[in-house]
């Protein structure tokens, strides 16, 4: 149990203890949400106090002060997902339609997602906002006809499901064109029934 002497300048629990060179001892760090209000000595361990309002310390530490809670910067494309607490800084993420363009331990700057051209869609990512769009072609039987960062490929219309016949096959960029079986010329319609 700290404090205890250490000749080799290392402590048994690196996460929760630190080496104090003046006394050549290992002392307790303060837990998240607290700071050092009185430093340790040979006879007394570190005394910790809770971070004041609007401040935090995230890790086991031997800081004599807490960090200022800061907002997510909207100009950098960030939005808040969880407020600051004594144990955790404000949690931020990229605003919808944006991705993280600069990373320094955490995201510091988001940019607009690139458009995916017609015939493609953005590959689904595990985590929203982590990277720019990677556009992949629509799979067979699907189409996407806009330039958009978020549009998804849709299945081609099945003319027979609507009692129609195919006038023009669908492509990656356009839907199937259907016509009434009794009509000789196909109308300029995409996947809709002519009444």
């Amino acid at each position: 149990v700290p404090p205890y002497g250490s000749e080799n300048q290392t402590c048994r629990d690196q996460e929760k203890e630190y080496y104090e060179p003046r006394h050549r001892i290992c002392c307790s760090r303060c837990p998240p949400g607290t700071y050092v209000s009185a430093k340790c000595s040979r006879s007394r361990d570190t005394v910790c106090a809770t971070c004041a309002e609007n401040s935090y310390n995230e890790h086991w530490n031997y800081l004599t002060i807490c960090q200022l809670c800061r907002p997510c910067d909207p100009v950098m494309g960030l939005e808040e997902i969880a407020p600051c607490t004594s144990k955790r800084k404000t949690q931020c993420r990229c605003q919808p339609g944006m991705f993280c363009a600069a990373w320094a331990l955490e995201c510091t700057h988001c940019e607009l997602l690139s458009d995916c051209p017609p015939g493609t869609e953005a590959e689904l990512k595990d985590e929203v906002g982590k990277g720019n769009n990677h556009c992949v072609p629509c799979k067979a039987g699907h189409f996407q006809n806009t330039s958009s960062p978020s549009a998804r490929c849709q299945p081609h219309t099945r003319c027979e499901d609507q009692g129609l016949v195919e006038a023009a096959p669908g492509t990656a960029q356009s839907d199937t064109t259907c016509r009434n079986p009794s009509e000789s010329l196909p109308p300029e319609m995409s996947g809709t029934m002519l009444m």
């Epitope: 609007n54 800081l63 004599t64 807490c66 960090q67 809670c69 800061r70 907002p71 909207p74």
Partner: antibody, heavy 120, light 113 residues
Framework: QVQLVQSGAEVKKPGSSVKVSCKAS????????ISWVRQAPGQGLEWMGG????????NYAQKFQGRVTITADKSTSTAYMELSSLRSEDTAVYYC?????????????WGQGTTVTVSS | DIVMTQSPDSLAVSLGERATINCKSS????????????LAWYQQKPGQPPKLLIY???TRESGVPDRFSGSGSGTDFTLTISSLQAEDVAVYYC?????????FGQGTKVEIK
């Protein structure tokens, strides 16, 4: 009482580098972010960057990125600001400053300033 | 970065009169979660480093005379010297600490008329 004492005035040639020191006393050096702020003659205040000594991580203003290096020596409670590729526009008073209420809050304590003159 | 713009650039006021300095930020410096404005005011006299006067937009630093007061919220802030004294002749700066990339206004020079 916290005191920040800076190194003396420097005269430098264009293209060279300058390294200004800031020694802290009367407080826990490593727990507070040290900022560097400069002021050209007759001009306003301009934040250059800062460092949290206990973390060792520095943070720079876009304008100075790649030209300024801020470091800290915990053993001597001293912070350093090195500015390279000096030009005449870098002639200014350079201040170090630190907060007191929070690790990285508003700037309460300021050094006396170091005059750097860049001239051929 | 957040741009801070002060007005006027200079101000001449008679002794005992009120001096008002305005500061506008390019984006809000109000954090809605704690309802605090991340704005400070500094005073700088010739040949001296800046001195903190006000933080959280309106909280006076200890030892600062009560003739100095700060007000405002969001993007618009004001520093008021209710009764100008000779020792108040200086340049005044507003500064945001909403981001860790601190920025300052261009300064307002206060002189005696």
């Amino acid at each position: 009482q916290v005191q920040l004492v800076q190194s003396g005035a420097e005269v430098k040639k264009p293209g060279s580098s300058v390294k200004v020191s800031c020694k802290a006393s009367g407080g826990t050096f490593s727990s507070y972010a040290i900022s560097w702020v400069r002021q050209a003659p007759g001009q306003g205040l301009e934040w250059m960057g800062g460092i949290i000594p206990i973390h060792g991580t520095a943070n720079y203003a876009q304008k100075f990125q790649g030209r300024v290096t801020i470091t800290a020596d915990k053993s001597t409670s001293t912070a350093y600001m090195e500015l390279s590729s000096l030009r005449s526009e870098d002639t200014a008073v350079y201040y170090c400053a630190r907060p007191s209420y929070y690790l990285d809050g508003w700037l309460d304590y300021w050094g006396q300033g170091t005059t750097v003159t860049v001239s051929s | 970065d957040i741009v801070m713009t002060q007005s006027p650039d200079s101000l001449a006021v008679s002794l005992g009169e009120r001096a008002t300095i305005n500061c506008k930020s390019s984006q809000s410096v109000l954090y809605s979660s704690n309802n605090k404005n991340y704005l400070a005011w500094y005073q700088q006299k010739p040949g001296q480093p800046p001195k903190l006067l006000i933080y959280w937009a309106s909280t006076r630093e200890s030892g600062v005379p009560d003739r100095f007061s700060g007000s405002g919220s969001g993007t618009d802030f004001t520093l008021t010297i209710s009764s100008l004294q000779a020792e108040d002749v200086a340049v005044y700066y507003c500064s945001q600490y909403y981001t860790t990339h601190y920025t300052f206004g261009q300064g307002t020079k206060v002189e005696i008329k």
